[in-house]
Interface confidence: low
């Protein structure tokens, strides 16, 4: 029987619902449908339709309430600037097609802030930032008119306000009203006008979510307030005592759908993993909800700061858990969060007011029962004493992020719930949660975690040195002999670990150049410390021209490094930092770390190489299991080692071996890679296990890395577990906490 004929009460026929130039998919077991158009097109006049109780689909109505007979996919346009103050833009057009560009310039006496050139993107949004022409005459700077919005108010004195509006049919995201505050900042966040077809791309979300959560502050801790003249950026700080509560609130109602629920869970697992990788332990609260909320993890539970345990609880939640009561009562869910925040008998725990609260709500924004959830956000603000004291408003202590999921998102609702902070975005509308796992990268303010080892800023906007912040470039200038290039790794504020063979006994400190963080300037060197057992000529009499056993050196710098996002240390084995990085118990021994990092098998690792002035990660396998012997035996193919009778003469227990074609074809190191770290990447952290020493085959002749290399092209690295007593002795004042 055709589905349309044998339909249950309140279900609708699919006859005539097609869309010209696109397709549709059913949602909520046939109670709604979503029109899907190719990239660069949007469904006109509506994106979704609901099945009415009469058995007919909701009417196709335009924004000005005209009825349309058939849906169609239309080309996406970007809105035109309704107004542009104190300047001109060109070209002028009623609308702009994807890839069109506009340019802004200011009248004399006005300076342009934001983007001078903007491009219409495939999602109907303009690239770049709002262009603003400002003459600096106001107490606050001109807040601008985001394209598509209209602004009322052109006085920017202290406590003056401006309001923003959208054209009919568009929804305002951000702050409708902004007030000029002490310190010269505007309250709230920049508005924008959203059409129903607009989604945030994963990249946009990643960038905005990330930058909001990683905003930094200069100087004052929020608890102690700050003077009115000091304009602040915010930060979310996780200090090691774990003074942050993160509440994960997940909509499990009918309207969300099982696949989005699963996707949201994946994102949150990723988020927990990312936060944990920072070596800090926020407490988690975990709530799912439909008609009623269900608290899976309370922040007061002993294990709520155990990331692995919280992840396990999250993974065990089923979409079906709310099946019988499948309304959407967001208010009740937030009340569950409120109950976790509040303390019994009004007696707060020590440090209550240094605890930062982050609510991450994933919903379709369609609350259909229980009342307006915004009232609970107000209660939470009241409880945390936020916005009560003009001098110390404590706004930093609460962040509400709302991820609207799926085509039925009610933009007004999700915007109302989200925090509004200057230059930050807390509300996101996403098509599919599965796309969003890359969103949950860096969670916290760097300033508190800069000293954490093996941390990287893995965002797409990051430079090479954001991604490899430990990497050091070493150059030795030898008069009349050219120069030698090596790599090294920052291991503490004063030391860079590298290979001893990069230097000769004749090299003077002033002829050794070290640079870090991609900076042009060279660092002054105090001394180079060689491993006492290193002697390249140690086996010359035995016919071994070069002997690389104990090929490690530490460069001590004259001045302390200033850690930042592009300069920070790598983790060393058998230190407390590595214990924390691997999320092992504090009682972990050096042997247990070794078993974790170098088990008797093929171990996935990486090294960093410079190719065409770019740093790239190369994935290799350390042969530490059944392939170890054959890997080491290939050393006989190295120039000068062909006469060696017993390969253990040159491949001592100090070496780790990589390269070859099994289990995968490993890339090889080049001469300039020597001294660089061999790294194991675990739990989002980077731990150095070796120092690149020597290779069997020079695969980089003529400055080009050969694509085809023989199977015996192996590389040998000094195993740091084998030189720990020396490292421990030389780095004893560096606070690394050797085990």
């Amino acid at each position: 029987t055709p589905w349309s004929l044998a339909r249950p009460q309140g279900s609708c026929s699919l006859e005539g619902v097609e869309i010209k130039g696109g397709s549709f998919r059913l949602l909520q077991e046939g109670q709604a449908l979503e029109y899907v158009c190719p990239s660069g097109f949007y469904p006109y006049p509506v994106q979704t339709r609901t099945c009415r109780s009469t058995g007919s689909w909701s009417t196709l109505k335009t924004q000005d309430q005209k009825t349309v007979r058939k849906a169609e996919c239309r080309a996406i346009h970007c809105p035109r600037p309704h107004d542009f103050e104190n300047g001109e833009y060109w070209p002028r057009s009623p609308y702009y097609n994807v890839s069109d560009e506009i340019s802004f310039h200011c009248y004399d006496g006005y300076t342009l802030r934001g983007s001078a050139n903007r491009t219409c993107q495939v999602n109907g949004r303009w690239s770049g930032q709002t262009a603003i022409c400002d003459n600096g005459a106001g107490y606050c700077s001109n807040p601008g008119i985001p394209i598509g919005t209209r602004k009322v108010g052109s006085q920017y004195r202290l406590e003056d306000s401006v309001t923003y509006h959208c054209s009919r049919g568009l929804t305002l995201r951000g702050s409708q009203r902004r007030t000029c505050q002490e310190g010269g900042s505007w309250s709230g966040t920049e508005p924008s006008c959203q059409d129903s077809f607009m989604y945030d791309t994963p990249q946009e979300v990643a960038e905005a979510f990330l930058s909001s959560l990683t905003e930094t502050i200069e100087g004052v801790d929020a608890e102690d307030g700050h003077g009115p003249g000091e304009q602040q950026k915010r930060k979310i700080v996780l200090d090691p005592s774990g003074s942050m509560n993160i509440y994960l609130v997940l909509d499990g109602s009918d309207s969300i759908g099982a696949s989005n629920f699963t996707g949201a869970k994946k994102c949150l697992v990723n988020l927990i993993e990312k936060v944990a990788s920072y070596g800090v332990k926020p407490r988690y609260g975990l709530v799912t909800y439909a008609t009623y909320p269900k608290i899976w993890v309370k922040v007061s539970e002993a294990d709520s700061s155990n990331a692995d345990w919280v992840t396990k609880q999250l993974n065990e939640i089923n979409y079906e858990d709310h099946k019988l009561k499948s309304g959407t009562n967001t208010k009740k869910a937030l009340q569950a969060v409120y109950s976790m925040m509040s303390w019994p008998d009004d007696v707060p725990p020590e440090g209550w007011n240094r605890t930062r609260h982050v609510i991450i709500l994933m919903t379709d924004g369609l609350h259909n029962m229980g009342g307006d959830p915004i009232t609970v956000i107000d209660e939470i603000r009241d409880l945390l004493y936020i916005g009560k004291d003009r001098k110390n408003p404590r706004e930093d202590y609460l962040d509400v992020y709302v991820f609207g999921v799926g085509p039925l998102v009610n933009q007004v609702n999700i915007n109302a719930l989200a925090s509004k902070k200057d230059n930050e975005q807390h509300v996101f509308k996403v098509k599919d949660m599965e796309n969003l796992e890359d969103v949950f990268y860096q969670m916290i303010d760097e300033s508190q975690s800069l000293s954490l080892c093996g941390m990287v800023w893995e965002h797409r906007k990051g430079t090479d040195y954001h991604k490899q912040p430990w990497q050091a470039k070493i150059s030795v200038i030898r008069p009349s002999k050219g120069h030698e290039s090596c790599m090294g790794a920052v291991v503490s504020e004063y030391f860079v670990l590298t290979a001893a063979h990069c230097f000769t006994v004749d090299d003077k400190e002033h002829s050794i150049k070290v640079s870090v963080g991609g900076e042009k300037r060279d660092l002054e060197i105090e001394v180079v410390l060689f491993h006492p057992n290193y002697n390249i000529n140690g086996k010359k009499e035995a016919g071994i021209p070069e002997f690389y056993d104990y090929d490690v050196a530490l460069i001590k710098l004259k001045n302390k490094l200033k850690y930042g996002q592009t300069i920070r240390p790598i983790c060393l084995p058998c230190t407390e930092g590595t214990t924390r990085a691997l999320r092992l118990p504090p009682t972990t021994t050096c042997q247990q770390q070794k078993e974790e990092l170098l088990p008797a098998q093929d171990i996935k690792a990486l090294f960093v190489s410079e190719e065409e002035k770019k740093l790239t990660r190369k994935e290799v396998y350390i042969k530490n299991g059944d392939k170890k012997g054959s890997c080491e035996r290939d050393a006989q193919y190295a120039p000068g080692y062909d006469k060696v009778k017993d390969i253990s003469e040159v491949v001592t227990p100090r070496f780790l071996c990589t390269g070859g074609v099994s289990p995968y074809a490993d890339p090889n190191t080049c001469r300039g890679d020597s001294g660089g770290p061999l790294i194991v990447h675990k739990r989002s952290r980077f731990i150095q296990v070796g120092v690149i020493s020597w290779g069997v085959v020079d695969v980089c002749k003529n400055q080009k890395r050969q694509k085809q290399v023989p199977a015996h092209a192996r590389d040998f690295h000094i195993n740091l577990f084998q030189v720990l007593p020396w490292l421990k002795e030389k780095l004893q004042d560096e606070d690394l906490g050797f085990l």
Epitope: D224, W352, R354, K388
Partner: antibody
């Protein structure tokens, strides 16, 4: 037990300054804010401001911003209030009181006995 | 600033009676209202905070109620030592403000 011991009565001339003290004992000094309250003869109570002894951060009632200066000495667990440019309007009893732990909206749970200031030429 | 109006300003009662004192805020202060007792020769005593929470060590005949803008202090079966000056104070928003006080005297 918690005690706030205030310094003795002050007699001052108009235009002069006075500095009174409030010595805390019986609890961790740096964990609680100290508030100051004014009471003129036969009148009600007025909140002057508070200081966080741990950080020295303070906030004042706008009305007393140019009148009172609050400081704290952690080593002696003592908070000081200086009143400047005295006039007859400043003749009053001044109380120090302990606020909630680290500034929670808890009321003032322990009070000093008060310091009487008389401004007269 | 939040204005606090306290009534009555004067009240006469006998031991054993129950009395109430009211305070009204000029805008909502949630539940954050405190009540104090002021007796000559003694330091001021906190009785109630957060509208209805009894400070430790205070007898249970003292109770507070209310939220938003209207609050009440009730003293049931008055004891001789209860005759004193009583003040309410909002501790919701700086600057903190006090009611004008109620003098409770023996009838």
């Amino acid at each position: 037990q918690v005690q706030l011991q205030q310094s003795g009565a002050e007699l001052a001339k108009p235009g002069a300054s006075v500095r009174m003290s409030c010595k805390a004992s019986g609890y961790t000094f740096t964990n609680y804010w100290i508030h100051w309250v004014k009471q003129r003869p036969g009148q009600g109570l007025e909140w002057i401001g508070y200081i966080n002894p741990n950080t020295g951060y303070n906030d004042y009632n706008q009305k007393f911003k140019d009148k009172a200066t609050l400081t704290a000495d952690k080593s002696s667990s003592t908070v000081y209030m200086q009143l400047s440019s005295l006039t007859s309007e400043d003749s009053a009893v001044y109380y120090c009181a302990r606020g909630g732990q680290l500034g929670l909206r808890r009321a003032m749970d322990y009070w000093g006995q008060g310091t009487s200031v008389t401004v007269s030429s | 600033d939040v204005q606090i109006t306290q009534s009555p300003s004067y009240l006469a009662a006998s031991p054993g009676e129950t009395i109430t004192i009211n305070c009204r805020a000029s805008k909502s202060i949630s539940k954050y209202l405190a009540w104090y007792q002021d007796k000559p020769g003694k330091t001021n005593k906190l009785l109630i905070y957060s509208g209805s929470t009894l400070q430790s060590g205070i007898p249970s005949r003292f109770s507070g109620s209310g939220s938003g803008t209207d609050f009440t202090l009730t003293i049931s079966s008055l004891e001789p030592e209860d005759f004193a000056m009583y003040y309410c104070q909002q501790h919701d928003e700086y600057p903190w403000t006090f009611g004008g006080g109620t003098k409770l005297e023996i009838k």
